[in-house]
């Protein structure tokens, strides 16, 4: 008697966030048992895709060419064995950057921050927006925060570090969204290099309540809600 | 908690036989494919063996095919690799594996040594 | 057969350096190669898995990349108890092979 069917992996490569025009391939692995692999995305008609296993049959590919708004949603997929259907994979966001005009994104009182000191990051968008999101490059699992004002649109938003230590320095980007498609966010701003001086050491800074902190790919997304003044959006950010 | 403990490990002359098995709790075990791989004195890993999750499919290196058969109880949530006419260079620390894309989890090995 | 070669063979770095290791298929594996750990005396353990993919409890410091024939296994910011033999294996096709390994010493 066979026990339930592993819900397959599922992941996109290079990563879950994609430029527009640009192209990405989503993975479901399952077991060598697979026969079929089937792809479904939130508010399409299902399936939205069916693959046969590439060998040794414990996976499938489903290849987009080129990033657009209709690919950027939710996805998730499923293998069929002998012995049915598996549970449905996590849920995949993709996620297509370039659907509006850049921020800017700043650094309050300066970029140069002495650790123990406290600075703010600064995204602002020329036209409104409701979702503002800050990431850090370069670290195995860059930190993605949100900002949302009951979903009031916004020019701008603020993401305080206190206390700012060492390893708060590196550099960052910003992104503005509107609250209806959290799949959809604006061309990256500009980096901005934040460098800390100084030897104050903190291992484990604690961001203030406003910055939601990504703990990596097990997280889970909350989406904002109307009643919470500073709702945090976490995603593991590829 | 997933725990893979294997057993069976002897020592047998050249040409000999041994059945080794492996333990699994802690996972929906007939629904996973699991894996044999062995680690020479040397300390090279190599793999030995994979068995599908029914039990419907198996796998082997040239180096064992013919000589070794992987097999599995999914009742007794049980893996086994029957080997025979074995040779001096089969010495290794054997492990079993719990293959979920990769080799997710292993167990803590178990030794076969082939000598006269 | 696919043949992957690891290199350096032997690695000594002193915590807080970040240090990178190579894994180099024979052919191509699209993205079909793993990276594991042993410790002395311990079974392997799974650190990332289809090149990049990362595994729940293992730290965020190891992270993997690279495609086809060329991977990277990179610890940002060694800790000391990183020390080991590094394993790369692929699943592109049977035989399922594994790298010789890459031994990772502390100062």
């Known amino acids: 008697q066979a026990g339930p069917l592993p819900k397959p992996t599922l992941w996109a490569e290079p990563g879950s966030v994609i430029s527009w025009g640009n192209s990405v391939t989503i993975w479901c692995q399952g077991t060598l048992e697979a026969r079929e692999y089937r792809l479904d995305k939130e508010e399409s008609p299902a399936p939205w895709d069916r693959q046969n296993p590439l060998e040794p049959k414990n996976k499938a590919r489903f290849s987009i060419p080129s990033m657009t708004e209709d690919y950027a949603g939710r996805y998730r997929c499923y293998y069929r064995s002998p012995v049915g259907w598996s549970q449905p994979s996590d849920p995949l966001e993709l996620v297509m950057t370039g659907a509006y005009s850049k921020p800017t994104l700043s650094a309050l009182p300066s970029p140069l921050v002495t650790s123990g000191k406290s600075v703010t990051l600064l995204c602002q968008s020329r036209s409104p927006m409701d979702t503002f999101l800050l990431i850090k490059e370069r670290a195995a699992h860059p930190l993605l925060h949100l900002r949302s004002e009951h979903g009031a649109q916004q020019h701008q938003a603020e993401f305080p570090m206190s206390p700012v230590t060492s390893v708060h320095g590196g550099t960052y980007r910003c992104f503005s969204s509107h609250g209806f498609s959290h799949y959809l966010l604006s061309h990256p701003s500009d980096p901005l290099e934040l460098i800390v001086s100084g030897s104050l050491e903190d291992p484990r800074p604690s961001p203030t309540r406003s910055v939601s902190t990504a703990a990596g790919p097990e997280d889970q997304p909350l989406m904002p809600t109307g009643s919470v003044p500073h709702s945090g959006l976490r995603r593991h950010w590829e | 908690e997933v725990k893979l403990v294997e057993s069976g490990g002897d020592l047998v002359k050249p040409g000999g036989s041994l059945k080794l098995s492996c333990a699994a709790s802690?996972?929906?075990?007939?629904?996973?494919?699991m894996s044999w791989v062995r680690q020479t004195p040397e300390k090279r890993l190599e793999w030995v063996a994979t068995?599908?999750?029914?039990?419907?499919?198996?796998y082997y290196p040239d180096s064992v095919k013919g000589r070794f058969t992987i097999s599995r109880d999914n009742a007794r949530n049980t893996l086994y690799l029957q080997m025979s006419s074995l040779r001096s260079e089969d010495t290794a620390l054997y492990y079993c594996?719990?293959?979920?894309?990769?080799?997710?989890?292993w167990g803590q090995g178990t030794l076969v040594t082939v000598s006269s | 057969d696919i043949v992957l070669t690891q290199s350096p063979a032997t690695l000594s770095v002193t915590p807080g350096d970040s240090v990178s290791l190579s894994c180099r298929a024979s052919?191509?594996?699209?993205?079909?190669l793993h990276w594991y750990q042993q410790k002395p005396h311990e079974s392997p353990r799974l650190l990332i898995k289809?090149?990049?993919q990362s595994i729940s409890g293992i730290p965020s410091r190891f992270s993997g990349s690279g495609s086809g024939t060329d991977f990277t296994l990179t610890i940002n910011s060694v800790e000391t108890e990183d020390f080991g033999v590094f394993f790369c294996?692929?699943?592109?096709?049977?035989?399922?092979?594994f790298g010789a390994g890459t031994k990772l010493e502390i100062k």
């Open positions: 594996e719990r293959l979920w894309g990769a080799m997710d989890y």
């Open positions: 068995i599908s999750s029914s039990g419907s499919y198996t």
């Open positions: 289809y090149a990049s």
């Open positions: 052919q191509g594996l699209t993205n079909d």
């Open positions: 294996q692929q699943s592109n096709s049977w035989p399922f092979t």
């Open positions: 802690g996972f929906a075990f007939s629904s996973y494919d």
